[in-house]
């Protein structure tokens, strides 16, 4: 029996009965938040062999082992993961061992076993036999191994029953509990699974099988399951489903959902039966089961019940995330906010069409409307009184509408109205008239030439750069000295700069009137000598990085009600020089013969230029005499070399409080103080733990639905 799509057992342990007939859980299994300690011995689910997503255990009181609950759980596929993990055991207060003695394969994802105060038998499991890569496993904060005394079956009687493997240079017996060994297949099977009698399974089997070399006798399938057989790919006219089985078109068409998109049913795309078309694709018609690529961003129509959507905060803008067509009217009223321009762009940046009108009023936080970066059509199907479809009133800091050199916006019906926008130059409004096709629609009072742009230097001269010099982390630039009609009107210059990988930035990117700005700003005083050109040294820059730079003259904006000229430069793109790259990462070497070494590494995190080649140096070292001190024919355990790992064992420190200088007479030494790198690593580790715990709580604790 297949159960799914994910089972959540919480609060009441008797809900476990839901697992009674399940052989495969198509989805996840959560067992969590059972605070009353119960006796789980009567609960046993031997039928369960596969979980297709992940297994999560969290705060289940009284549960001491998973072996009795799930004696035959063989595979966790990890088709979908819980924060990169396929097995999470977190804060299980009474768990003494994991005990999943038939678990042979975790196909995708890592494991996280954390804060289980009583949990032992962790160092006796060789996870590399179950997972492809163990480097991402996180096993922290459980019972200290010294306090566990883990013994594998038969060890006490000196008749060990389990096989040995090497983990972290320790060659030891591998087991799940005091009476269950960890199963290992003969080396002759290679990557294949094996039966209980150590016969190799069919290559398409995963985990185990009931008969050798038979693709119908698998406990689980390496690739896909179809009609009782494990197959490498789904046969013609069948489709992958949930990452583990093949289903036909009729099956896919008849899946019912309780998600918001259930009115259209599942789709078939790229050989897979899935809930919705993937990103970049759209259904080929409303009742179609097939997807076609979108031209540009995929259309998403959003509608406001009350016809007019008021955007007065980031939260209200959030409702429009992903919308490309907005059916209704937009009223934008942003008086304050943090990082408002980039937040609005994030949530409203895909809107292309507004069917009604757009009204922007009292939005003192806005400097530009460029956050509506894809708006290309205002239909004006509904208009404000006076037949206005674009209405801009009393926005104290609005300086730019859009970058009209890179913007096509059409207003199909209705007029425009602008009043009391003191920093918005009338020339900017006139430019909008031309671009949007509304020129001639407005009457004289619709664009007020007195109270729009009254506090701006609207007639801008262009400042020209005269020289640029770069080094690996500095840029020196100079520009022509600007001379307004009255030199007293010029106060200083402001240089704006930021990293710009592409040459597509505009002056108003990420800028709002509440202090958020993606540009770095530096004030430059006028040189006292009239003949010296103003300039600046920008330092602390990154090597081999392109920066965008522009300069603005700071001028008095009003002189007895006359608009005066300001000045600013074009945006200049300039790249710093290359520098020495940081060190290559993750250097590994291994010998594959008596005369060869294979050395691998990853590129440096900071190339600081275009990498053209690597230099590999090596030298012969004398043989270590340590290797000859041991008789390798003796049955004693081979000594393991211990390297200082830079961490302090609290117990050892308290045992040896006295400080002695090492050397001469050997005595206990103090642990070396932690390096900055170690401190930073610990800090990141603590941060990572917090992030995971937050993710866990946010996923699990959901408000009770009304």
């Amino acid at each position: 029996e297949i159960c799914g799509p994910g089972i959540d057992i919480r609060n009441d342990y008797q809900q476990l009965k839901r697992l009674e007939n399940c052989t495969v859980i198509e989805g996840y299994l959560h067992i969590l938040l059972i605070s009353k300690a119960e006796d789980y011995r009567s609960y046993r689910f031997p039928k369960l062999t596969v979980i297709t997503e992940y297994l999560l255990l969290f705060r289940v009181a009284g549960l001491e082992s998973l072996g009795d609950l799930f004696p035959n759980l063989t595979v966790i596929r990890g088709w979908k993961l819980f924060y990169n993990y396929a097995l999470v055991i977190f804060e299980m207060t009474n768990l003494k061992d994991i005990g999943l003695y038939n678990l042979r394969n975790i196909t995708r994802g890592a494991i996280r076993i954390e804060k289980n105060a009583d949990l032992c038998y962790l160092s006796t499991v060789d996870w590399s036999l179950i997972l492809d890569a163990v480097s991402n496993n996180y096993i922290v904060g459980n019972k200290p191994p010294k306090e566990c005394g883990d013994l594998c079956p038969g060890t006490m009687e000196e008749k060990p029953m389990c096989e040995k493997t090497t983990i972290n240079n320790e060659y030891n017996y591998r087991c799940w509990t005091t009476n269950r060994c960890q199963k290992m297949c003969p080396s002759t099977c290679g990557k294949r699974a094996c039966t209980e009698n150590n016969e190799c399974c069919h290559p398409e089997c995963l985990g185990s099988c009931s008969a050798p070399d038979n693709d119908t006798a698998c406990v689980a399938c390496r690739h896909y399951y179809y009609a009782g057989v494990c197959v490498p790919a789904c046969p013609p006219n069948t489709y992958r489903f949930e990452g583990w089985r093949c289903v036909d078109r009729d099956f896919c068409a008849n899946i019912l959902s309780a998600e918001s998109s259930d009115s259209e049913g599942f789709v078939i795309h790229d050989g897979e039966c899935m809930q919705e078309c993937p990103s970049g694709f759209i259904r080929n018609g409303s009742q179609s089961m097939y997807c076609i690529p979108c031209e540009g961003p995929c259309p998403k129509v959003c509608e406001e019940e009350k016809k007019t959507k008021t955007i007065d905060s980031v939260t209200s803008a959030q409702m429009l995330q992903g919308c490309t067509i907005f059916k209704g009217n937009l009223l934008i009223n942003i008086r304050r906010g943090n990082n408002i321009a980039s937040e609005l762009e994030n949530f409203m940046g895909l809107i292309e069409v507004v069917t009604g009108y757009v009204k922007i009023r009292h939005s003192h936080a806005l400097v530009s409307l460029s956050f509506l970066k894809n708006l290309r059509l205002i239909l004006g199907e509904e208009q404000l009184e006076g037949n206005y479809s674009f209405y801009v009133l009393d926005n104290q800091n609005l300086q730019q509408l859009w970058d009209w050199d890179h913007r096509n916006l059409t207003i199909k019906a209705g007029k425009m109205y602008f009043a009391f926008n003191p920093k918005l130059c009338v020339s900017e409004i006139y430019r909008m008239e031309e671009v949007t096709g509304t020129k001639g629609r407005q009457s004289k009072g619709d664009i007020n030439t007195r109270n729009n742009g009254e506090r701006a230097s609207c007639e801008s001269d262009v400042l020209h750069f005269t020289s640029t010099t770069t080094s690996k982390n500095r840029i020196i630039i100079t520009w022509h000295r600007y001379r307004p009609p009255d030199y007293r009107d010029l106060i200083s210059f402001t240089v704006y700069y930021k990293e710009a990988p592409f040459k597509n930035v505009t002056e108003y990117d990420g800028q709002d009137a509440c202090g958020s700005n993606s540009w770095n700003m530096v004030d430059v005083d006028l040189p006292p000598n009239k003949d010296v050109e103003p300039g600046i040294l920008l330092h602390g820059l990154k090597p081999w990085t392109q920066y965008a730079v522009y300069v603005k003259a700071v001028t008095l904006t009003m002189v007895e009600n006359d608009h005066i000229r300001g000045a600013k430069s074009e945006i200049l793109y300039i790249r710093t020089n290359a520098s020495v790259p940081s060190i290559p990462l993750d250097v590994l070497s291994a010998s594959n013969s008596s005369s060869q070494l294979i050395v691998k590494w990853n590129p440096p995190s900071l190339p600081n230029g275009n990498l053209s080649y690597y230099i590999v140096r090596w030298q012969r070292q004398p043989q270590d005499g340590y290797l000859y001190r041991h008789n390798y024919c003796s049955k004693d355990k081979i000594p393991i070399r211990k390297y200082a790992d830079g961490t302090i064992d609290i117990e050892e420190v308290t045992e040896n409080p006295k400080t002695e200088v090492c050397g001469g007479e050997k005595g206990p030494c103090c642990a070396c103080p932690k390096t900055e790198a170690e401190k930073q690593a610990e800090k990141e580790e603590a941060e990572y733990r917090k992030v995971f715990e937050n993710f866990l709580h946010n996923s699990i604790f959901v408000p009770r639905p009304e």
Partner: nanobody
Framework: EVQLVESGGGLVQPGGSLRLSCAAS????????MAWFRQAPGKGLEFVSA????????RYADSVKGRFTISRDNSKNTLYLQMNSLRAEDTAVYYC????????????????WGQGTLVTVSS
């Protein structure tokens, strides 16, 4: 936890009609796929019909297609089964079931079940 209570069963003559109801208590009724199953005397459990969370899509067993109609009223947290042209072979205990998020056509292990209501079709 979801509790389900069926009602509306009884004795009806062949060719007659009956309407079953299933009242759900618990969270977010619309986030469950709802279904009707039946068990005839001495037989196994048989799927009858299922309906999506919003009520816009439904699925029927071939044996009841064209005669039975499943529907739901999410504002009243209630599932219905309108049974017309009833036959003797429709005699069974009818169970209401709920599954969160999704239900595939081969799913019989629904998460929550009612106690059942008996429908007897006999002259």
């Amino acid at each position: 936890e979801v509790q389900l209570v069926e009602s509306g069963g009884g004795l009806v003559q062949p060719g007659g009609s009956l309407r079953l109801s299933c009242a759900a208590s618990g969270p977010a009724f619309s986030s469950f796929v709802m279904a009707w199953f039946r068990q005839a005397p001495g037989k196994g459990l048989e799927f009858v019909s299922a309906i999506s969370g919003s009520g816009s899509r439904a699925r029927y067993a071939d044996s009841v297609k064209g005669r039975f109609t499943i529907s739901r009223d999410n504002s009243k947290n209630t599932l219905y089964l309108q049974m017309n042209s009833l036959r003797a072979e429709d005699t069974a205990v009818y169970y209401c079931a709920a599954n969160p998020r999704r239900a595939t056509p081969d799913l019989t292990q629904y998460a929550y079940w009612g106690q059942g209501t008996l429908v007897t079709v006999s002259s």
